[in-house]
């Protein structure tokens, strides 16, 4: 429906509070280096303008698009050229090119200081004295570090953040109450950001069709009782929501997400028996709950897939009449029967089936040609099954930290050109798959493992895209979305790599190592391990294990010494020399 004023329309739909929060998130995701106060000023100016449009939709400039209004506002920032360099050139462009330009300048790894958590009392005082500013600062800090964070979901996180402070700042032991909650929110936030980053990458790099296919698989698994047309209705609306959020249209995105939640709750009977509890919650919780709802039970009367997709005499006729609809139905039917498969595997199966039909429907005996098509799926299914079995066995044998090390060695040998911080971050996240998925029941393991790995490998892809250094990474990241994980799994040791020259500084440690948290110590050790592999790519796992054990013993010894710094200075070079010998 056409509205005289888009900004007034969204202000009225969303309400002032959500409107302001979403504009703050949008601006923070675009201008990631701007100070908080500058953003607050811009948000207040936009909000005051929106109110004039609500009062009179025909008022001056109220008919302008949101991109025009927001872009004009961003381009008033005085220090744009000094702070952002060539991003300032975006302001010379007209819409829609200007917005596209801003999107291209979003930085997945902005040069921002790590967030330091103040003392609990300091945080509680700030929360109690200036609650609104405190919560808006949270939105700003998360949004600028995660420029693709799913905006309506970030408002949900802010609500949880507020609830944690409201409860814990009253508690007898504030820290014991608050810190675990903040840790959990941080971890959930990082996971949410990474999942959304994959959605945006799917849309931006592989197009709407790829995203819709993935969504059909997931929604069909969740709502196996729903009719195909209901699944595609939800998928179509979901695609619109994510296209908007990934494109920076956060007000439209949040508004449409609320509409989708409303539709789903009004049509529970056609979708799933699992939505009832979600639908009783207020908006932000409701949308979050619907997005994470468990799979409904499969209908009992599902007939064999082969009836319609192998045995039927009309397979080629139906395929030829409407290829996209036929393939959509195949994906829906297969997915609703297989909650135990990963979405990526289901997409590979659909791709294989389509390729077989393309080939067979052009032959004299199509049925004879595609009769065994489902048998051809077997190796595709066994690949992720073996991946899960092998990696969960390793995880159970090693535990998370050593499993991360195993993956770090594996990936450093595959793509040694990638920067050490990226290899460490990605391998640590890959290793968390064990903790997250290996304890799950058999039927949930594969979707958990492979779809989680897809999210983590996408982090590697987006970080690598910023500064490409490896053709092999580029190839795996760009050739096929559904085959990214198998592509990385199939990479062997890079035999063309010339070992990195030894740099003593890389392997020099100081007493500050002893004051680091366990996590920070692990990162230090894993950084050294990656550098070691880059220096000695032919080293065996046994050799590396020995060196790492010696290294752990060295750190433990020096951290217990009276003169820690002297110990590090004396014992460090000895360890390096011994390691050189062990790896020769």
């Amino acid at each position: 429906d056409a509205h005289k004023s888009e900004v007034a329309h969204r202000f009225k739909d969303l309400g002032e509070e959500h409107f302001k929060d979403l504009v703050l998130v949008a601006f923070s995701q675009y201008l990631q280096q701007c100070p908080f106060e500058e953003h607050l000023k811009l948000v207040n100016e936009v909000t005051e303008f929106a109110k004039t449009c609500v009062a009179d939709e025909t008022a001056e400039n109220c008919d302008k698009s949101l991109h025009t209004l927001f872009g004009d506002k961003l381009c008033t920032v005085a220090t744009l050229r000094e702070t952002y360099g060539d991003m300032a050139d975006c302001c010379a462009k007209q819409e829609p090119e200007r917005n596209e330009c801003f999107l291209q300048h979003k930085d997945d790894k902005p040069d921002l200081p790590p967030l330091v958590r103040p003392e609990v009392d300091v945080m509680c005082t700030a929360f109690q004295e200036h609650e609104d500013t405190f919560l808006k600062k949270y939105l700003y800090e998360v949004a600028r570090r995660h420029p693709y964070f799913y905006a309506p979901e970030l408002l949900f996180f802010a609500q949880k953040y507020k609830a944690a402070f409201t409860e814990c700042c009253q508690a007898a032991d504030k820290g014991a109450c608050l810190l675990p909650k903040l840790d959990e929110l941080r971890d959930q936030g990082k996971a949410s950001s990474a999942k959304q980053r994959l959605k945006c990458a799917s849309l931006q790099k592989f197009g709407e069709r790829a995203f819709k296919a993935w969504s059909v698989a997931r929604v069909s698994q969740r709502f196996p009782k729903a009719d195909f047309t209901e699944v595609t209705k939800v998928v179509t609306d979901l695609t619109k929501v994510h296209t908007e959020c990934c494109h920076g249209d956060l007000l439209e995105c949040a508004d449409d997400r609320a509409e989708l939640a409303k539709y789903m709750c009004e049509n529970q009977d056609s979708l799933s028996s699992k939505l009832k509890e979600c639908c009783e919650k207020p908006l932000l919780e409701k949308s979050h709950c619907l997005a994470h709802v468990e799979n409904d039970e499969m209908p009992a009367d599902l007939h064999a897939l082969t009836d319609d997709y192998v045995e039927s005499k009309d397979v080629c006729k139906n395929y030829a009449e409407a290829k996209d609809v036929f393939m959509g139905m195949f994906l829906y039917e297969y997915s609703r029967r297989h909650p135990d498969y990963s979405a990526m595997l289901l997409l590979r199966l659909a791709k294989a089936y389509e390729a077989t039909l393309e080939k067979c429907c052009a032959t004299a005996d199509p049925h004879g040609c595609y009769a065994k098509v489902f048998d051809e799926f077997q190796p595709l299914v066994e690949d992720p099954q073996n991946l899960v079995k092998h990696n969960c066995e390793l995880f159970e044998q090693f535990g998370e930290y050593k499993f991360q090390n195993e993956l770090l060695v594996r990936y450093t040998k595959k793509v040694p050109q990638v920067s050490t911080p990226t290899l460490v971050e990605v391998s640590r996240n890959l290793g968390k798959v064990g903790t997250k998925c290996c304890k799950q029941p058999e039927a949930k393991r594969m979707p958990c493992v492979e779809d989680y790995l897809s999210v983590v490998l996408n982090q590697l892809c987006v970080l690598h895209e910023k500064t490409p250094v490896s053709d092999r990474v580029t190839k795996c990241c760009t050739e096929s979305l559904v085959n990214r994980r198998p592509c990385f799994s199939a990479l062997e040791v890079d035999e063309t790599y010339l070992p990195k020259a030894f740099n003593a500084e890389t392997f020099t440690f100081h007493a500050d190592m002893c004051t680091l948290s366990e996590k920070e110590q692990q990162v230090k050790k894993q950084t050294a391990l990656a550098e070691l592999v880059k220096h000695k790519p032919k080293a065996t796992n046994e050799q590396l294990k020995t060196v790492m054990e010696d290294f752990a013993a060295f750190v433990e010894k020096c951290c217990k010494a009276d003169d820690k710094e002297a110990c590090f200075a004396e014992e460090g070079p000895k360890l390096v020399a011994a390691s050189e010998t062990a790896l020769a």
């Epitope: 009719d227 195909f228 209705k233 179509t236 609306d237």
Partner: nanobody, 117 residues
Framework: EVQLLESGGGLVQPGGSLRLSCAAS????????MGWVRQAPGKGREWVSL????????YYADSVKGRFTISRDNSKNTLYLQMNSLRAEDTAVYYC??????????WGQGTLVTVSS
């Protein structure tokens, strides 16, 4: 009892347009996906288009994509098919049909569309 009554067929020249209508009764129209199916002389039935109850999601056979537009007015219990750039191969009896999960379970009597110069 479910009733579907098509209208709007007729003779049209190649490149011309027609709009078919289908009046539905005997069921809760806005709860069901609806569609159009056609049968050319001497041929089998061919699916043409589908529309979700909300009217916001549509599906088309590849042969009509970009030329035909399906729509519905739930307040009038009516289904439409706007046919543009008609070709001789579009000549057929067009049936309005009600969709139930995976198949069409009810059909109208059909309306004849003839594309000829």
């Amino acid at each position: 009892e479910v009733q579907l009554l098509e209208s709007g067929g007729g003779l049209v020249q190649p490149g011309g347009s027609l709009r078919l209508s289908c009046a539905a009764s005997g069921f809760t129209f806005n709860h069901y996906t609806m569609g159009w199916v056609r049968q050319a002389p001497g041929k089998g039935r061919e699916w043409v288009s589908l529309i979700h109850p909300s009217g916001t999601v549509t599906y088309y056979a590849d042969s009509v994509k970009g030329r035909f537009t399906i729509s519905r007015d739930n307040s009038k219990n009516t289904l439409y098919l706007q046919m543009n750039s008609l070709r001789a191969e579009d000549t057929a009896v067009y049936y309005c049909a009600k969709w139930e999960k995976k198949y069409f379970d009810y059909w109208g009597q059909g309306t004849l569309v003839t594309v000829s110069s």
